[in-house]
Structure formats: C-alpha cells, structure tokens
C-alpha cells in the first residue's frame, strides 16, 4: 500500500509535470506566436484510455516529436526555456511516476490530435490524478 | 517485456565491409532513439551515435562520424551499424540500447563481438 | 564536448562497507542528463540511476544518486556480493553523450 510520503511526493511530481505542460501550452497559445499555424499541422497520437499512471507510456512515447514541435517553435516571441532541459525534466518525472520499466503497450486512439489537443489531454489527466490524491 | 536482440559474433579481415544488427520487441520501436555503444577490449563505454527510427533521424559522435553508418528499418523493428572498410582498431564489443530523449539508456542488447584481424 | 572524470579509478572494500564514488564534470549541466549504470564481467551495462538521483525500477534502494552542476556522487550504502562490478557515469547535457572512464568496485 503506498505511503503516505510516497502520495505526497507523487503528488509533487504530477504538479511539476502539470506546471510544465501548461507552461508549454500557454506559450503555444500566446496570440503572438506566429508558428502556431505550422505547429497545429503536426499529428500527435492520443491515448485510448488514460487513466492510471502507467497510463503516462504513452505520453514518453511522444516526447520525441514533442521536442521537434518546440524546436520549431522557438522564436522571439515564443521563448521557453531551453527546450531539451523541458522535455528531458518531463521524462525523468514521467518514468519515475510510472516506473522505468513499465512492461504497458500503449493503446492509441485511431484519430491523431494537433499539440494543443494533445497537451490539453495530458493537463486533464495530470489533474484527474492529483485530484484523487487529495 | 522489451527486449533489443544484436547479431552474433563477427570475425572478420582489414578492408571487408560489415553491417550488424539490433532487433527490438516488446515496445513501439518508431518511439525511442537507438543507440549504439563501443567497448574497446578491458576498456570504457563510448557512444558512437542514435538514430530514431520513427523518421530516420540520425545523429553521430564527432569522433565516429563518417567512421559508420547507422540505419534503421522500421518495418522489421531493426537497427543497424555498419562499416565499409573495417580496420583492425575497431575489433570491440558493441552494444545497442534504447536510449531515452533525456540520454538514459534503459534497455541494452546483450553486444556482438566484432573482431578485425590479418 | 563534456568530459567526465570518475575517481577513484578502483574502490577495494569488504561487502557490508559503504561505497561513495564521484563524476566530475568538466562543465555544468542539468542533473535531469546524470546517468549511473553497472556493468559485470561479460554482461551489458545495466541502468542504475537516471537524473541524477532516481533509481531505475528494480533497483535496490542500498544505490542512490546525489548531485548537481559539475559534481556527481553514487553511494551504495551496504556492499553486497553482487555489486562488485565496474560503475560508469554518463551525461547526455549537451551532444555527443560522453561516459565517464569507470569505477571499479572490488573485494578486498
């Protein structure tokens, strides 16, 4: 049965991949960004079910082509912090919420999403869990 | 469970051409990098270069690139290392491992050895 | 390209004593990037740690992982038999991915 140190530092690691994502949203978002249009053209592949943490193997396998989307990005006006500490900060959280050695065969939805998409459904999971948690 | 299988051991002469092999199961193999690793006998671990085999992208050491080619064919899973004139020096054991975007290596094969003598 | 430079180069000790070995950096990255792995005679490299301090699934919590900038550290904190092995660092905070030279870990 997990801790009750193990919920709250669960807890902890979903809010900073929650933080994150929005953060990579928000910048998307921006009504200045003038790569926006180009970005929505790339596909994301969306999970069929996402309910549990083991669930985020299909958010690691994305992680790719959402570096290459943000890479893209990059521009005066649409600035993150350095792309690859993001996404690599993203990973390290994700395998140590779901477990480095997650045996899952992600489950995809049959119809693609655009980034926004994509980053709005990993927001909702991430709050889902946390409110469960609290 | 994830498993990456490498091509049996390799003798082979200075000069002759040798492409080993790296297959992965148990995983969507087009989602990860691939990468690849030399060990020198009773030496350390040198990365040599990944490719992702979801679109190709491949990228190499300073100190192997134009050394080898490193290749992908994901529609049987595989990677690939290659060499078009083997040279005595590049007898070593090589790994490939699934490497992970933040550089984590997480699942490694269990190496071929690539021996290169006269 | 980052250098990494493990010290010390053989670590003699009896199981149940505490190991502390240390990658040095020759410039600051991440920690997300600080990798740890193990490697036994005939054997593939094992991952062990990964950004710095999290133990990869199955990984007995006797191995942990501290640091961050330029200084690195690995701590097993009771010997056990099977973890005398050669122990290499590695970083991925800017390309190429470099590995540091190895620890080697043996009984004395």
């Known amino acids: 049965a997990p801790t009750s140190s193990s919920t709250k530092k669960t807890q902890l690691q979903l809010e900073h991949l929650l933080l994150d994502l929005q953060m990579i949203l928000n910048g998307i978002n921006n009504y200045k960004n003038p790569k926006l249009t180009r970005m929505l053209t790339f596909k994301f592949y969306m999970p069929k079910k996402a309910t549990e943490l083991r669930h985020l193997q299909c958010l690691e396998e994305e992680l790719k082509p959402l570096e290459e989307v943000l890479n893209l990005a990059q521009s005066k006006s649409f600035h993150l912090r350095d792309t690859k500490d993001l996404i690599s900060n993203i990973n390290v959280i994700v395998l140590e919420l779901k477990g480095s050695e997650t045996t899952l065969m992600c489950e995809y939805a049959d119809e693609t999403a655009t980034i926004v998409e994509f980053l709005n459904r990993w927001i909702t999971f991430c709050q889902s869990i946390i409110s469960t948690l609290t | 469970e994830v498993q990456l299988v490498q091509s049996g051991a390799e003798v082979k002469k200075p000069g002759e051409s040798l492409k080993i092999s790296c297959k992965g199961s148990g995983y969507r193999f087009t989602s990860y990098w691939i990468g690849w690793v030399r060990q020198m006998p009773g030496k350390g671990l040198e990365w040599m270069g990944i490719?992702?085999?979801?679109?190709?992208?491949?990228r190499y050491s300073p100190s192997f690139q134009g050394q080898v080619t490193i290749s992908a064919d994901k529609s049987i899973s595989a990677a690939y290392l290659q060499w078009s004139s083997l040279k005595a020096s590049d007898t070593a054991m090589y790994y490939c491992?699934?490497?992970?975007?933040?550089?984590?290596?997480?699942?490694w094969g269990q190496g071929t050895l690539v021996t290169v003598s006269s | 390209e980052i250098v990494l430079t493990q010290s010390p180069g053989t670590l003699s000790l009896s199981p149940g004593e505490r190991a502390t070995l240390s990658c040095r950096a020759s410039?600051?990255?991440?920690?997300?990037?600080l990798v740890w792995y193990q490697q036994k005679p005939g054997q593939a490299p094992r991952l062990l740690i990964y950004g710095a301090s999290s133990r990869a699934t199955g990984i007995p919590d006797r191995f942990g992982g501290s640091g961050s900038g330029t200084d690195f550290t690995l701590t097993i904190s009771r010997l056990e038999p099977e973890d005398f092995a050669v122990y290499y660092c590695?970083?991925?905070?800017?390309?190429?991915?470099?590995f540091g030279g190895g620890t080697k870990v043996e009984i004395k």
């Open positions: 410039q600051s990255f991440s920690s997300s990037y």
């Open positions: 491992a699934r490497q992970q975007v933040a550089g984590m290596l997480d699942y």
């Open positions: 490719i992702y085999p979801g679109d190709s992208d491949t």
């Open positions: 590695q970083q991925y905070g800017s390309s190429p991915l470099t």
